[in-house]
């Protein structure tokens, strides 16, 4: 039992405070911002990560066409309300009592309203399309090698069950990763596709959430895969409800 094993940190979430004061000296970690206990053997929910991020000091054609109902996170960062399990609450409000409904990945799916706005349930995002453009390379990547490497990444780094990586599409320089996970498919202990996509997004931006690990070093047959643009589309089990004004804008 070496000193290295005595390191009380959260390997899957560096935005935590940990101390070995759990039962029998167990290392217990709490997310910054919410103070909620997190399970460091798996990914932390996106809601708790966003909350931690907001509490931290500020610093610095085989391709899929997204459906008309696909959402893009245009609103950016906000300080979310999370439920006791760390999931997004269906209704989110800011300090000025402006409220809106979100999906399971925390992306707004209705027009903004006031405190009277009702969000009856948290609608599940069951399909995520990650759209990447890689930097120019000498030649195109081999599609099957790229597919295998990205599937390995989601399986090993993000612990997402392979069945939830529905497809990897490639038309140089665009790569699309499709994640699909219906409510009925997600078993207890399964990583949520929304959480995996968020960890991937932060990795791609060079803002890894993992403790002490180096940044993401994506290579396909030894060739670095460097991403210069990322767009993520979210499809919900129930289509979003926006007014016509937004849809025609």
């Amino acid at each position: 039992h070496t000193a290295a094993q005595d390191n009380c940190t959260c390997p899957t979430n560096k935005m935590t405070v940990c101390s070995p004061d759990g039962p029998g000296g167990r290392c217990q970690c709490r997310a910054l911002g919410s103070g909620m206990a997190v399970d460091c053997s798996t990914l932390t929910s996106k809601c708790l990560l966003l909350k931690a991020r907001m509490s931290a000091p500020k610093n610095a054609r085989t391709l899929v066409r997204p459906s008309e109902h696909a959402l893009v996170d245009n609103d950016g960062l906000y300080d979310p309300d999370c439920d006791p399990e760390g999931r997004f609450k269906a209704r989110q409000c800011n300090q000025t009592s402006v409220c809106w409904c979100v999906n399971s990945v925390g992306v707004r799916r209705t027009d903004k309203g006031d405190l009277s706005l009702r969000c009856d349930e948290l609608v599940r995002t069951h399909h995520i399309l990650i759209d990447l453009r890689h930097r120019p390379t000498a030649g195109a990547f081999n599609h099957s090698d790229l597919d295998a490497e990205l599937r390995r990444l989601f399986r090993e780094r993000y612990r997402l069950h392979p069945k939830f990586v529905a497809a990897v599409h490639y038309e140089q320089p665009t790569i699309q990763i499709e994640l699909r996970q219906n409510t009925s498919q997600k078993a207890a202990g399964d990583v949520d596709i929304g959480d995996a996509a968020y960890y991937f997004e932060r990795d791609i931006k060079g803002e890894s959430l993992f403790q002490g690990r180096g940044g993401l070093d994506l290579r396909v047959r030894g060739e670095p895969l460097q991403v210069e643009r990322t767009l993520i589309y979210y499809l919900d089990e129930i289509p979003p409800k926006f007014s016509m004004k937004r849809l025609t804008a």
């Epitope: 009380c8 101390s19 004061d21 039962p23 029998g24 000296g25 167990r26």
Partner: antibody
Framework: QVQLQQSGPEVVKPGASVKMSCKAS????????INWVKQRTGQGLEWIGQ????????HYNKNFKGKATLTADKSSNTAYMQLNSLTSEDSAVYFC?????????WGQGTLVTVSA | DIKMTQSPSSMYAFLGERVTITCKAS??????LSWFQLKPGKSPKSLIY???RLVDGVPSRFSGSGSGQDYSLTISSLDYEDMGIYYC?????????FGGGTKLELK
């Protein structure tokens, strides 16, 4: 190496109090919890409570609330347990143990005898 | 509180024999289980933690296994120095609770 040196045996009268010590060495005292365990002759082990010197947080077995008080002195790397209102039921060997993720290093024990 | 039921409460075994002691928790404890050996006049000795991890310096004849509610400690080939009382401890939640102990004696 990790060592926990406990204070010597105590013979006390019923109704009195006793305070025993557990001096830690070989590691950073504030990085680990100290647990206290009771062993009565011919009986099993009973968990009393846990203190974390790093933040002075503690947890007690409800059976020992009001009976045991756990403290820690960071300057001397010593954990203490005081037992109040002693009765013959409190006659036992008391162990301190440093725990991390269920792995324990134990002190040699302090024998407390409650006798009129 | 989580109740730990240990069995047998006592047993006799020959030197070289394979010995298994079991502990059943009243609810799942997520592998947060330790095993200790206690000898008269000595302090407890840690053998196994996290259900199956062997403590440094403990002979490899000791092993732990189990999951959920059911756990066991096995001594593959009993040695004379293995005589004593064995206890399991759950540390899944407060309060920590010990099993009732298993007294192991030589046949």
């Amino acid at each position: 190496q990790v060592q926990l040196q406990q204070s010597g045996p105590e013979v006390v009268k019923p109704g009195a109090s006793v305070k025993m010590s557990c001096k830690a060495s070989g590691y950073r005292f504030t990085d680990y919890v100290i647990n206290w365990v009771k062993q009565r002759t011919g009986q099993g082990l009973e968990w009393i409570g846990q203190i974390y010197p790093g933040s002075d947080s503690f947890h007690y077995n409800k059976n020992f609330k009001g009976k045991a008080t756990l403290t820690a002195d960071k300057s001397s790397n010593t954990a203490y347990m005081q037992l109040n209102s002693l009765t013959s039921e409190d006659s036992a060997v008391y162990f301190c143990a440093r725990f991390f993720e269920g792995l324990a290093y134990w002190g040699q024990g302090t024998l407390v005898t409650v006798s009129a | 509180d989580i109740k730990m039921t240990q069995s047998p409460s006592s047993m006799y075994a020959f030197l070289g024999e394979r010995v298994t002691i079991t502990c059943k928790a009243s609810q799942g404890i997520n592998n947060y289980l330790s095993w200790f050996q206690l000898k008269p006049g000595k302090s407890p000795k840690s053998l196994i933690y996290r259900a199956n991890r062997l403590v440094d310096g403990v002979p490899s004849r000791f092993s732990g296994s189990g999951s959920g509610q059911d756990y066991s400690l096995t001594i593959s080939s009993l040695d004379y120095e293995d005589m004593g009382i064995y206890y399991c401890l759950q540390y899944d939640e407060f309060p920590l609770t010990f099993g009732g102990g298993t007294k192991l004696e030589l046949k």
